[in-house]
């Protein structure tokens, strides 16, 4: 799902207040609900009729450093006989998410939000056909 | 997918540098890749064999203010005849994501990262049967 544009109003102080110096804001250390955890069914990526694999990308200057991307294994979906059936299609489910980018020059460290597109898994759909003349 | 614990090392300055004053960091205004957009197939939530509905939650002190949560419509999956087949199960696909929480007291505005669990969509899986003695 989409993250709307900031319009930068979210990060601005109220109009009656002095502006933020140097185009930066104060980010408190620590993460709210840091211990919250995904509680998905086990191995759904293999048990799904639209199975997927995971690829991990790693970047030490990003938080979280590890971002996991899913790739659908098949064009079609897996039928009751365990065969790929192309009358249906496996499609990726995507989500826009935020990460934090770390930028440093010597002892001067700053952070910036970054929007990342994550493919979270796949689902099986009826395909839409377009006929091209 | 999981976001690992910060361990707060990511947000710390190098050991040789003076510590961050007041437990906060500098967050630059603006979002990298802000114009990046989800390019999912249209209406996959209705075309899926494990269809889902969306609920929007709104919080003006969160960025993004709008967070969309999916809920699977059925226990089973929709078969070729358009009927629910309970020999298969619709299951949610979840993703941990970051949002930014805005906290203000008068003209003093600070921000903090918050971890949010988002259900992005649903997929159809072969159920695992546990027999309880």
């Amino acid at each position: 799902r989409k993250i709307p544009k900031v319009g930068h109003t979210f990060f601005q102080k109220p109009e009656s207040c002095p502006p933020v110096p140097g185009g930066s804001m104060k980010l408190d250390i620590g993460i709210i609900n840091e211990n919250q955890r995904v509680s998905m069914s086990r191995n759904i990526e293999s048990r799904s009729t639209s199975p997927w694999n995971y690829t991990v990308t790693w970047d030490p200057n990003r938080y979280p450093s590890e971002v996991v991307q899913a790739q659908c294994r098949n064009l079609g979906c897996i039928n009751a006989q365990g065969k790929e059936d192309i009358s249906m299609n496996s499609v990726p489910i995507q989500q826009e998410t935020l990460v934090v980018r770390r930028k440093h020059q010597g002892c001067s460290v700053s952070f910036q939000l970054e929007k990342v597109l994550v493919t979270v898994g796949c689902t099986c759909v009826t395909p839409v056909i377009h006929h091209v003349q | 997918r999981k976001i690992p614990k910060v361990g707060h090392t990511f947000f710390q300055k190098p050991e040789s540098c003076p510590p961050v004053p007041g437990g906060s960091m500098k967050l630059d205004i603006g979002i990298i890749n802000e114009n990046q957009r989800v390019s999912m197939s249209r209406n996959i939530e209705s075309r899926s064999t494990s269809p889902w509905n969306y609920t929007v939650t709104w919080d003006p002190n969160r960025y993004p203010s709008e967070v969309v949560q999916a809920q699977c419509r059925n226990l089973g999956c929709i078969n070729a005849q358009g009927k629910e087949d309970i020999s298969m199960n619709s299951v949610p696909i979840q993703q941990e994501t970051l949002v930014v929480r805005r906290k203000h007291q008068g003209c003093s505005v600070s921000f903090q990262l918050e971890k949010v669990l988002v259900t992005v969509g649903c997929t159809c899986v072969t159920p695992v049967i546990h027999h309880v003695q």
Partner: antibody, heavy 129, light 108 residues
Framework: QVQLVQSGAEVAKPGASVRLSCKAS????????MHWVRQAPGQGLEWMGV????????SSAQKFRDRVTLSRDTSTATVHLEVSRLTLEDTGIYFC??????????????????????WGQGTAVTVSS | DIQMTQSPSSLSASVGDRVTITCRSS??????LAWYQQKPGKAPERLIY???NLQSGVPSRFSGSGSGTEFSLTISGLQPEDFATYYC??????????FGGGTKVEIK
């Protein structure tokens, strides 16, 4: 020259299996799905199934689903149709035909100018006890 | 599944006649229809695609029309080589293909 060349006639007994082949030439094999159509003696045309060349995914008509296997060999640009548990009603001509459809992520595009335009010459299958 | 009803199932005509064959689909298939000619012992050959487009190399006496659920193939000025069986094919319902029952055009 764009063509589909099918394997020769087959004679089989009831209960046996046959494996037919269809070799593509003159066009990019992996860009076209391949359908199989059969025609019983003096009858009309009946769709059996289709195979997608890249991953080898298939779809078959309900009536054939449990005894038809479609496969492909990209190295030789050939598709195969195997029909098992043959009955006398399986006697007929079996055709392969190309389809210019391309599907990805739930959206398919078919270029109609070269959809179902090229057919194989047909393979005669006779089931007789 | 989409049903294709083709009529007539057979007809007798003379050289030079104007012949029209119709195909009716059980639901809207837009213009996702082709017409084929088949001669005994041969594979079908496409005459018309996308309901009304003439296949390259096919004589202009063949024409197709219609969209939605009603389609027709017209041969204006039947020639001796046109005596054959004609089929319509719908390809709107991916991946399933459905053929009409066929129309045999015979010499009167």
């Amino acid at each position: 020259q764009v063509q589909l060349v099918q394997s020769g006639a087959e004679v089989a007994k009831p209960g046996a299996s046959v494996r037919l082949s269809c070799k593509a030439s003159g066009f990019s094999f992996i860009k076209y799905y391949m359908h199989w159509v059969r025609q019983a003696p003096g009858q009309g045309l009946e769709w059996m199934g289709v195979i997608e060349p890249t991953g080898g995914g298939t779809s078959s008509a309900q009536k054939f689903r449990d005894r038809v296997t479609l496969s492909r060999d990209t190295s030789t640009a050939t598709v195969h149709l195997e029909v098992s548990r043959l009955t006398l009603e399986d006697t007929g001509i079996y055709f392969c035909v190309r389809d210019s459809i391309y599907c990805k992520h739930g959206t398919c595009h078919r270029t109609v100018i070269d959809a179902f335009d090229i057919w194989g010459q047909g393979t005669a299958v006779t089931v007789s006890s | 599944d989409i049903q294709m009803t083709q009529s007539p199932s057979s007809l007798s005509a003379s050289v030079g006649d104007r012949v029209t064959i119709t195909c009716r689909s059980s639901q809207d298939i837009k213009n996702d229809l082709a017409w084929y000619q088949q001669k005994p012992g041969k594979a079908p050959e496409r005459l018309i695609y996308a309901a009304s487009n003439l296949q390259s190399g096919v004589p202009s006496r063949f024409s197709g029309s219609g969209s939605g659920t009603e389609f027709s193939l017209t041969i204006s000025g039947l020639q001796p080589e046109d005596f054959a069986t004609y089929y319509c094919l719908q390809h709107n319902s991916y991946p399933l293909l459905t053929f009409g029952g066929g129309t045999k055009v015979e010499i009167k």
